[in-house]
Interface confidence: low
């Protein structure tokens, strides 16, 4: 019997590699392009981890765009100082010195200053004598009870250089600022070969639920958990501790209908703030049943179980768990590398390329 | 039982002087916040003065700031309010109360019966 | 200085009734916000603290709620004693500030 095909087989035989062909270069872009949709309470680090992106993708930020952010580290650092007064008071806690009380009222008088970008050496003044203050810094140790910008003591203790008249944020000042997040906001970057766009939905407070969907389909999600808010009282407005509102976020995400195809990247944020919290604080505070030491290693692995836990599909889904510092761009760094590696392979995979 | 008994009240000419006492027992007076409160004929309640324990940093009203002083002796368990340059519109019952901070919110839980002070000639 | 703004100002119910009296903060105040009865001749009396904590020894009858700028104070079935002025205080910032009273009078 011959081998040789036909004129109309040799056209269907083209045909199939030419389909094939395609596929292929569509998986291969499918696979090139990455959808990362951030999530997490409040206060979690998820912008701070957009910045790291700007930082670390995308050469950074300009010497006009730092200039820009001089406004943000004054309010920054005036609301950090105010809250604390402010707190003295519901907490009843006196000034060392009485003429403080004269300082916080003058405060009050000149922070309006600071908006326009401006910090003027008598408002700098006066909030350094505030910090330097023995009951500030008695009543900023007890801020587990109030709400406080983790950035108050970075900008506090470095006065000096922040209210120079020729100061321009660094990136790392840049890194510490506080912006409430409104809407979407996207960012795009490319890295090993790979084009990412990442969204940060932090600012949608909308009802989640009409909305998530929007998302079905996205490479992976990062999940950011401030391991610091295991401590923090509860205010008045909030039904539950903030460690376990983001449990009950996390649950909701990772046992999503929605992304049952999604790769689910955990931070475990802001270790460098529990390392020094767990040494004062025990984990009881938020978890009663815990019986270990008070140690960062087995405390962190604690809070790190009770997220996992919470995945209801152990054997088809991995959770990928990494402790992060969002403010180290070289942790950030090295934890990025890692999750993209994870994205390739599992991006691999599902195009059938692995 | 937290009892505050206030005292000093009375008739007195518009630019006279007078001091209000307020005599606190049945709680750890010294690690106590305590305000001044007055209340104008028919009219609603107005903060005057508080002072904090430890340090006794002062707080004030604008309508009687470097007229009235707020002062405490925790040895006697007493909080006072020196009124000076009083002026018609000073007139009310003033009360002392405690305040008190629970769960980092504070609020007024105990007031004196008050004392009433007439400024008029 | 925060303006705490009451409305009514008066209102006339009978024993038995319902009745929620306002309280509006002229900036947020977060749940900050302090509820007291003052009876003709007498001190004024805490009700309610921190918006909603019931003060030890007040009839459940009363209860608050709100969280922000705007605030409700809530008496379920008025009782004879209930007839009173009602005041808000704002506990959030210096200085410290009351509503002007609701007086609430038997119908």
């Known amino acids: 019997m011959g081998c040789t095909l036909s004129a109309e087989d040799k056209a269907a035989v083209e045909r199939s590699k030419m389909i094939d062909r395609n596929l292929r270069e569509d998986g291969e872009k499918a696979a090139k392009e990455v959808k990362l949709l951030l999530l997490g309470a409040g206060e979690s680090g998820k912008s701070t981890i957009v910045k790291q992106m700007k930082i670390i993708h995308e050469d950074g930020y300009s010497e006009d765009e730092c200039k820009q952010y001089k406004v943000v580290v004054y309010s920054n650092t005036i609301q950090s100082i105010i809250a604390i007064i402010r707190a003295m008071g519901r907490l009843k806690i006196d000034f060392g010195e009485a003429a403080r009380a004269d300082d916080a009222r003058q405060l009050f008088v000149l922070a309006g200053s600071a908006e326009e970008g401006v910090m003027t050496p008598e408002l700098a003044g006066v909030i350094k004598r505030l910090w330097r203050d023995g009951g500030v810094q008695a009543c900023f140790s007890r801020s587990r009870e109030y709400q406080l910008n983790d950035s108050a003591s970075y900008y506090l203790n470095d006065l000096d250089r922040i209210s120079q008249s020729n100061y321009i944020p660094t990136q790392q000042d840049v890194l510490r600022t506080r912006v409430k997040t409104t809407g979407i906001v996207e960012t795009h970057f490319t890295f090993k070969d790979l084009y990412f766009k990442m969204f940060d939905v932090g600012g949608q407070r909308s009802e989640r639920k009409k909305w998530i969907h929007c998302f079905e389909g996205v490479t992976a999600i990062i999940f950011c958990v401030a391991l610091s808010d295991y401590d923090l009282v509860l205010a008045e407005d909030e039904e539950m501790n903030r460690m376990h509102e983001s449990m009950k976020l996390f649950d909701s995400i990772c046992n999503n209908k929605w992304f049952t195809e999604t790769s689910i990247i955990l931070f475990l944020n802001k270790k460098d703030l529990f390392e020094e919290k767990i040494k004062r604080s025990p984990l009881t505070i938020c978890y009663p049943e815990y019986t270990g030491s008070n140690t960062y290693e087995e405390a962190a692995a604690y809070i790190q179980c009770q997220f996992e836990d919470l995945n209801r599909r152990k054997d088809t889904k991995e959770i990928y768990t990494h402790f992060t510092c969002a403010t180290d761009t070289k942790n950030v760094q090295f934890v990025f590398d890692a999750v993209t590696d994870v994205i390739i392979k599992n991006n691999l995979k599902e195009c059938g390329l692995y | 039982e937290v009892q505050l008994l206030e005292s000093g009240g009375g008739l007195v000419q518009p630019g006279g002087s007078l001091r209000l006492s307020c005599a606190a027992s049945g709680f750890t007076f010294s690690s106590s916040y305590m305000y001044w409160v007055r209340q104008a004929p028919g009219k609603g309640l107005e903060w005057v003065s508080s002072i904090s324990s430890g340090y006794s940093s002062t707080y004030y009203a604008d309508s009687v700031k470097g007229r009235f002083t707020i002062s405490r002796d925790n040895s006697k368990n007493t909080l006072y309010l020196q009124m000076n340059s009083l002026r018609a519109e000073d007139t009310a019952v003033y009360y002392c109360?405690?305040?008190?901070?629970?769960?980092?919110?504070?609020?007024?839980?105990?007031w004196g019966q008050g004392t009433l002070v007439t400024v008029s000639s | 200085d925060i303006q705490m703004t009451q409305s009514p100002s008066s209102l006339s119910a009978s024993v038995g009734d319902r009745v929620t009296i306002t309280c509006r903060a002229s900036q947020s105040i977060s749940s900050y916000l302090n509820w007291y009865q003052q009876k003709p001749g007498k001190a004024p009396k805490l009700l309610i603290y921190a918006a909603s904590s019931l003060q030890s020894g007040v009839p459940s009858r009363f209860s608050g709620s709100g969280s922000g700028t705007d605030f409700t104070l809530t008496i379920s079935s008025l009782q004879p004693e209930d007839f009173a002025t009602y005041y808000c205080?704002?506990?959030?910032?210096?200085?410290?500030?009351f509503g002007q009273g609701t007086k609430l009078e038997i119908k």
């Open positions: 205080q704002q506990a959030d910032y210096y200085p410290p500030t």
């Open positions: 109360a405690r305040d008190v901070s629970h769960g980092g919110h504070s609020f007024l839980d105990y």
